[in-house]
Structure formats: structure tokens, C-alpha cells
């Protein structure tokens, strides 16, 4: 670091003074020197190091007419917002000829009310759930002792006696405010007041009570909500993303969920208007006057299959001698599941009903017994899923085949010797 030499008398006629104050202070240090000839540039040192980017001014006033006469030079150093890093010993420095001169030192100190490095933050917590709050303050002067307050009531008998930087709260049952006081020799500073909002705990044990093709009944166990009664619970259902799935902890569903509100108690809800035989994910959150709990994890559920809601369409039945040709189309009504096949029943006026499982084909050729003189033969068709048969179509009378009418070639199906079972649908 530059050192002044004492070979010549110091040119400084005014030295920096001292500044002590609180953070943020704006202060100015000054030094003054009297030199002969060209005035030098005045540099500022802090703790012996030149301040390269000093916010300093310099003014020089000649004391005579001649440039070689004496000059008064005044340099001012601005400290705009005093911080701990600004503290130290300050001096002015000039180079005159081959010599370096430094002024007498001035000192900048920081001393004031405690300054918060960290203050408690607003947050939400679930009822009766432990959490921590942080507070940190510094001087100078040190030491700085902290005193925590809950709802403006001190949590210790005196500053420094209770928890300091971290306050552990084992749980709250009502929304509360917390602040901390920082005490030092200069006085007391109070932190911001943090509001800790007590929300209901996350509901537990979300489960299915019953399933129907278009509705699910679900129930759950509510969490604690402190002194605030639950006002309602909200259930969300979302169609599962085929193959992708919703991860257990995923915060948001991939599409707009179906949302239903449940009055509580009971902690149960019937979710209607669902698609049959469809995978869903559901979750629930409960709300008090203070706000909603966190959502439960997504629970995968599935609506069961239902029976088809309508009969097959466009049934036609024609007869040519001992053969009957029947064909139809898939029901237009929702199948409510995976179509497994069709059942066909036919009956004559004086003959027992014959019931057949056709499988997934939509046409069949029936080989009629006898000479085909059975009168008033009618055919009915129903679609079925794993859940059972859908409604049977209305009876379709067998029409005689007329020459020129298209006759598809069908695999012949022998009628069973005895009907599998009989339907009282006639």
C-alpha cells in the first residue's frame, strides 16, 4: 500500500473526519491540500487500498495569478448508502513529484439499530403441522439478541433467552402472526409481521365406495382444520391419459378436470355423468374459511362396463326355402363397454324359441329344420358386453326371398337341438 514519506512537509491542510451512522446513511469525507504549481489528482484510500471507482469530486482554486503559485485543492468522497463494506480507515493520497503523501485518516463506522438480514415470511401451514420460521439480524453494535413474538406476545422472558435464528413451531390450530424483535445497545428494531395461515390438513384415505358405469361414489377422511370448520370439499376427476397416466405427485392434470363440490359432512360424494368402462384419476381437497387444503395424490379409478344402451340397428331377415339370411348393424346407442358379440333369437308361431350366440359377426344364415313351412317366423338381435346383454330389438318378421333379390353367401349355422334358454320377450 502507498506510504507517505516524511522527507517533505505534508501538503494536507485538512484531513478526512469521522462518520458513524446507520445503514443507508449518505455521508461525505473531505480533505484539503495546498500545493505549489500544477494541482495533483487526489486519490482516496480505504484501509490502505486505492478506491478505483470512488464517487469523489475535486475542485482547485489558485491562490495567485501565476500557475506556479499555490493552489488549494479540495477533494470530497461520497458514501451514498452506508454498508458494512464501506467501513474502515479513509485517507487522501497524492503523488507530488517523486513523493507520495497521505493525509491523516478518518474513520467510517457503522453503528445503529439492528439490521435484518432475514425476516419471517408469510406462509400457509396445515393445522397441527410443525414448521420453522427464520429471523436474522446484525449490528454493529453487536451482540444482537432476538425476541420472537406470537400474536404480539413475547415467546421468551427477555431478548436472547428464547429461540434465536430459527423458531420451531410444533403446530397451530388458528391463523397467527409472528414477528421478531432485534435488540442491541442502540435500541430495538422490529421485523415485518408474518401471517401464518392455518389451512385444513390434506384429506386421507380417498377411496371408492361403489361403482356404476356412469357414476362413482367416493369417500375420504378429512384432516384436522384447527378452530375453523370445513365449509366444503372439492373433488376433481380427470380422464386418464392413455398410457401416460398421472404420476402420484404430479401437480396438475393434463386436461381440464371435472370438478364437484361436496357439502360436509358426510365426506362422501357421488360423481355422475362419467363415461362407462373408462379410467379416471380423482383427488380431493377440503376448504375452511382460511382456504383450501393441499390436494390428495391422484387416485386411479375406473368406471365398470355397462350393457349396451340400445339394440342393433337396421336388422333385415329374408327367407329362401329352408334358409334364412339375417344381418344387422352395430347399435347406435352407447355400448358402455367392449362389444363382445351378438345374441340372436328366432321363433315360429308354434315352435319354441331358439337362442344363438353369433359372436362379433353382423350377419348369419340360419338352416331351418323341416321343409321350411314354419309360419310367422320372427328374429330378434341383442348386443352384449362383459356386463351383460343390451336390449333386444323388436321382432323382425322373416320375409320371403324374391327372385332378383341379392343373396349373400353366408356360412351356414345349424340351429342348436335345444334352445340355450328362453326369453319372455314375445
Amino acid at each position: 500500500a502507498p506510504r507517505g514519506t516524511q522527507a517533505e512537509e505534508s501538503p494536507f491542510v485538512g484531513n478526512p473526519g469521522n462518520i458513524t451512522g446507520a445503514r443507508g446513511l449518505t455521508g461525505t469525507l473531505r480533505c484539503q491540500l495546498q500545493v505549489q504549481g500544477e494541482p495533483p489528482e487526489v486519490h482516496w484510500l480505504r484501509d490502505g487500498q486505492i478506491l478505483e471507482l470512488a464517487d469523489s469530486t475535486q475542485t482547485q482554486v489558485p491562490l495567485g495569478e501565476d500557475e506556479q503559485d499555490d493552489w488549494i485543492v479540495v477533494s470530497q468522497l461520497r458514501i451514498t448508502s452506508l454498508q458494512l463494506s464501506d467501513t474502515g480507515q479513509y485517507q487522501c493520497l497524492v503523488f507530488l513529484g517523486h513523493q507520495t503523501f497521505v493525509s491523516q485518516p478518518g474513520y467510517v463506522g457503522l453503528e445503529g439499530l439492528p439490521y435484518f438480514l432475514e425476516e419471517p415470511e408469510d406462509r400457509t401451514v396445515a393445522a397441527n403441522t410443525p414448521f420453522n420460521l427464520s429471523c436474522q439480524a446484525q449490528g454493529p453494535p453487536e451482540p444482537v439478541d432476538l425476541l420472537w413474538l406470537q400474536d404480539a406476545v413475547p415467546l421468551a422472558t427477555a431478548p436472547g433467552h428464547g429461540p434465536q435464528r430459527s423458531l420451531h413451531v410444533p403446530g397451530l390450530n388458528k391463523t397467527s402472526s409472528f414477528s421478531c424483535e432485534a435488540h442491541n445497545a442502540k435500541g430495538v428494531t422490529t421485523s415485518r409481521t408474518a401471517t401464518i395461515t392455518v389451512l385444513p390438513q390434506q384429506p386421507r384415505n380417498l377411496h371408492l365406495v361403489s361403482r356404476q358405469p356412469t357414476e362413482l361414489e367416493v369417500a375420504w377422511t378429512p384432516g384436522l382444520s384447527g378452530i375453523y370448520p370445513l365449509t366444503h370439499c372439492t373433488l376433481q376427476a380427470v380422464l386418464s391419459d392413455d398410457g401416460m397416466g398421472i404420476q402420484a405427485g404430479e401437480p396438475d392434470p393434463p386436461e381440464e378436470p371435472l370438478t364437484s363440490q361436496a357439502s360436509v359432512p358426510p365426506h362422501q360424494l357421488r360423481l355422475g355423468s362419467l363415461h362407462p368402462h373408462t379410467p379416471y384419476h380423482i383427488r380431493v381437497a377440503c376448504t375452511s374459511s382460511q382456504g383450501p387444503s393441499s390436494w390428495t395424490h391422484w387416485l386411479p379409478v375406473e368406471t365398470p362396463e355397462g350393457v349396451p344402451l340400445g339394440p342393433p340397428e337396421n336388422i333385415s331377415a329374408t327367407r329362401n326355402g329352408s334358409q334364412a339370411f339375417v344381418h344387422w348393424q352395430e347399435p347406435r346407442a352407447p355400448l358402455q363397454g367392449t362389444l363382445l358379440g351378438y345374441r340372436l333369437a328366432y321363433q315360429g308361431q308354434d315352435t319354441p324359441e331358439v337362442l344363438m350366440d353369433i359372436g362379433l359377426r353382423q350377419e348369419v344364415t340360419l338352416e331351418l329344420q323341416g321343409d321350411g313351412s314354419v309360419s310367422n317366423l320372427t328374429v330378434c338381435v341383442a348386443a352384449y358386453t362383459a356386463a351383460g346383454d343390451g336390449p333386444w330389438s323388436l321382432p323382425v318378421p322373416l320375409e320371403a326371398w324374391r327372385p332378383g333379390q341379392a343373396q349373400p353367401v353366408h356360412q351356414l349355422v345349424k340351429e342348436p337341438s335345444t334352445p340355450a334358454f328362453s326369453w319372455p320377450w314375445w
Partner: antibody, heavy 125, light 107 residues
């Protein structure tokens, strides 16, 4: 004799720009901080910013930061206030003022001892 | 920012009266307070710096006092030329801030 003279005020539309000058005489700009302060009836005096003409360092009020720029030319002994993106609320009489620096080896805070006569800036459509 | 609150906002007084104007800072500003006088259409004039120091050329009937948060400007014997608006200003922290002004009118 120490003197500060502002110029450059006038009527400007919202969003427009204006450059004010502050010509100093009787002292060297490089020896002190120069402040800009404005006065609007009903609002009183409001500090706009300062410059250290010797170093070129400037400091601004939040209300003008990013819109106003203070500069100085020590060879002309003149400070400037460049005002861009002007708003109706910038309407005021603008003063430049010299910071007083006669307080010994150190001081906390500052005062402004010499002020210009002011120049009126009106922002209106 | 530090707020400076002046009181009263206006007052009526007669020549020869003793007038006191107060200024309160929202936080400790040590003695970094200045007082200015402003007349309509004119530039402000510095009266007091560093809370209690009389600026050169200012009549001695003006005086300032206070430190911390409470400051006072006193005019010991009001003169005709003293009818004006007076402002306090803190410069302990940047930005410096002014009081809203106290208008001294003739009674």
C-alpha cells in the same frame, strides 16, 4: 459570483423528450455534486437526481429512473437533464442546485446552497 | 424512503411574531436536515443546514434545532420579507426527501 441558469423548458406531448441545461458560473462544476429538483403546485419539492460531474456518476429518484439521464460537460461547466418518455405528472418547474460543501472534514447528509431560477416543463397533449 | 411531515401546513402571523415550524422524520435522520425558504416564482433559498447551522448571509432571527426525528425552524421576530413557504429536507439517506411545506401568511 456563483450562478446557475437553467434553460430548455417548454411544452411537450406525453411520451416526448426534452433536454434541460444548467450553466454554472462562479465555481467549477467538478468540485461538487449537482442536483436536479422539481416543484409542482400541490406536490411541493421533489428531488429528481444528482450527478458528480467530476466522475460522471449519477443517481436518480425511482420515479424517473430509466426515463431521465443526468450528464455534465465540465469543459462547458454545464449539467444536463435529458427527459424521455415524459408523462403528465412530470409537469413542474425544474431547478438545478449545487450541493453545499463547507462542513469541514466530514458530514452526514447535504444541503443545496445555490439554485437556478427554474425552467417550466409542461407535459400535455 | 424517509417521510418528512411538516406542521402546520399553513399559519397566519403578524410582523414581530415568533414563529415555530416543526418537521418530523419517519425514522432517525441524525442531524441531516436542512430548511429552505421559497417564494412564488422564485428558487428555494437555504436557511439552515445540518439541523442547526445558519447558512452564511441568512439573518440570525432564523434558527434550527433538533436531531433524530424531530426538528424545528424558529423565526424569532417575523419580518415582512419572511412571508413565504418553508420546507424541511432530510438527506440522511438517498433519495433526499422534502416536507410538504408550511405557508407563512400575514394575519
Amino acid at each position: 459570483e456563483v450562478q446557475l441558469v437553467e434553460s430548455g423548458g417548454g411544452l411537450v406531448q406525453p411520451g416526448g423528450s426534452l433536454r434541460l441545461s444548467c450553466a454554472a458560473s462562479g465555481f467549477s462544476l467538478s468540485g461538487s455534486w449537482i442536483h436536479w429538483v422539481r416543484y409542482a403546485p400541490g406536490k411541493g419539492l421533489e428531488w429528481v437526481g444528482w450527478i458528480n460531474p467530476y466522475r460522471g456518476y449519477a443517481y436518480y429518484a425511482d420515479s424517473v429512473k430509466g426515463r431521465f439521464t443526468i450528464s455534465a460537460d465540465t469543459s462547458k461547466n454545464t449539467a444536463y437533464l435529458q427527459m424521455n418518455s415524459l408523462r403528465a405528472e412530470d409537469t413542474a418547474v425544474y431547478y438545478c442546485a449545487r450541493e453545499y460543501s463547507g462542513w469541514g472534514g466530514s458530514s452526514v447528509g447535504y444541503a443545496m446552497d445555490y439554485w437556478g431560477q427554474g425552467t417550466l416543463v409542461t407535459v400535455s397533449s | 424512503d424517509i417521510q418528512m411531515t411538516q406542521s402546520p401546513s399553513s399559519l397566519s402571523a403578524s410582523v414581530g411574531d415568533r414563529v415555530t415550524i416543526t418537521c418530523r422524520a419517519s425514522q432517525d435522520v441524525s442531524t441531516a436536515v436542512a430548511w429552505y425558504q421559497r417564494k412564488p416564482g422564485k428558487a428555494p433559498k437555504l436557511l439552515i443546514y445540518s439541523a442547526s447551522f445558519l447558512y452564511s448571509g441568512v439573518p440570525s432571527r432564523f434558527s434550527g434545532s433538533g436531531s433524530g426525528t424531530d426538528f424545528t425552524l424558529t423565526i424569532s421576530s417575523l419580518q415582512p420579507e419572511d412571508f413565504a413557504t418553508y420546507y424541511c429536507q432530510q438527506s440522511y439517506t438517498t433519495p433526499p426527501t422534502f416536507g410538504q411545506g408550511t405557508k407563512v401568511e400575514i394575519k
